[in-house]
Amino acid sequence: FKVATPYSLYVCPEGQNVTLTCRLLGPVDKGHDVTFYKTWYRSSRGEVQTCSERRPIRNLTFQDLHLHHGGHQAANTSHDLAQRHGLESASDHHGNFSITMRNLTLLDSGLYCCLVVEIRHHHSEHRVHGAMELQVQTGKDAPSNCVVYPSSSQDSENITAA
């Protein structure tokens, strides 16, 4: 399977909400021994590999923001902790999963990564990730709404193996 990032750049005004999106593509094993661990974290554009460094989003680690379920099932993060930080991650049964960030500030600008780990019980793991950039702008020149730009075909299917 692959992870696609439909959009690679989000340019938003301060105070706006934004939903960053990834999509799980390809054949997904729905067997009983397979679960999917989906999460989000911040990173930086490494010289060797993007998303290799895992940093928290608004003080929440990738463990705090994870979704854990089988196949293309719907899920949401535990509301209390994430929502106190203005965050919510969600997943639907079409393979889309997202993180919503509320009341953006300049400190939210940066590189965001979605991570999917396919866990086969008693066997191996398969990991893929996608990356996107969030630019939060302030002042009179900021856009009035988030402007969202597509990934190039090269970027839109970010595939990494464990």
Partner: antibody, heavy 118, light 106 residues
Framework: EVQLVESGGGLVQPGGSLRLSCAAS????????MSWVRQAPGKGLEWVAE????????YYPDTVTGRFTISRDNAKNSLYLQMNSLRAEDTAVYYC???????????WGQGTLVTVSS | EIVLTQSPATLSLSPGERATLSCSAS?????MYWYQQKPGQAPRLLIY???KLASGIPARFSGSGSGTDFTLTISSLEPEDFAVYYC?????????FGQGTKLEIK
């Protein structure tokens, strides 16, 4: 007052090249993404290119990818569109546009006509 | 790509009547923009951020809507209002336009 003034249009043969310019004034040019929009005679409006405020990101629809190049010179408050391998279907009025902000709507220039014909 | 569908394609009304132009987006967008265009002229911004009136535009023009359905209303048509109207989204690249609604004198 925000002003966008396009220039560089004209008659060119199929396969030829043309460079359009847009002179911007009345706002902090380097803070805005800028775009080119075109309108073929009797037709609707079509986005043809955008460039980010710093110039590092450029975007094109499939119809012009590989043929058109958008660029900017923030020191000169100028936007450019280099058009190569021009086709008859590129005949249109080309407008320079600036997106809106938190307090104001978008702005457009008055356009420059590009005619591709032999 | 977000497709914007304007309806009707042509609207025939008389001066003094109320005009309602619709714009439907294939996916949800934050804001809609409306332009008026007359022959040989550049598009003129009427409404930005869905409902804000652009500078110099008469108060008879108004915009509303959210998500996928947006409306431009002209409360009482003046002779100079007969033109082509375009909606546009500036949210998801490519920043698409509707195909236009021609407002003509009945």
């Amino acid at each position: 007052e925000v002003q966008l003034v396009e220039s560089g249009g004209g008659l060119v043969q199929p396969g030829g090249s043309l460079r359009l310019s847009c002179a911007a004034s009345g706002f902090t040019f380097s803070s805005y993404a800028m775009s080119w929009v075109r309108q073929a005679p009797g037709k609707g409006l079509e986005w043809v290119a955008e460039i980010s405020s710093g110039g590092s990101h450029t975007y094109y629809p499939d119809t012009v990818t590989g043929r058109f190049t958008i660029s900017r010179d923030n020191a000169k408050n100028s936007l450019y569109l280099q058009m190569n391998s021009l086709r008859a279907e590129d005949t249109a009025v080309y407008y320079c546009a600036r997106r809106g902000n938190l307090y104001d709507g978008p702005y457009w220039g008055q356009g420059t006509l590009v005619t591709v014909s032999s | 790509e977000i497709v914007l569908t304007q309806s009707p394609a042509t609207l025939s009304l008389s001066p003094g009547e109320r005009a309602t132009l619709s714009c439907s987006a294939s996916s949800s967008v934050s804001h809609m923009y409306w332009y008026q265009q007359k022959p040989g002229q550049a598009p003129r911004l009427l409404i930005y951020d869905t409902s804000k009136l652009a500078s110099g535009i008469p108060a008879r023009f108004s915009g509303s809507g959210s998500g996928t359905d947006f409306t431009l209303t002209i409360s009482s048509l003046e002779p100079e209002d007969f033109a082509v109207y375009y909606c546009q989204q500036w949210n998801f690249y490519p920043f698409t336009f509707g195909q236009g609604t021609k407002l003509e004198i009945k």
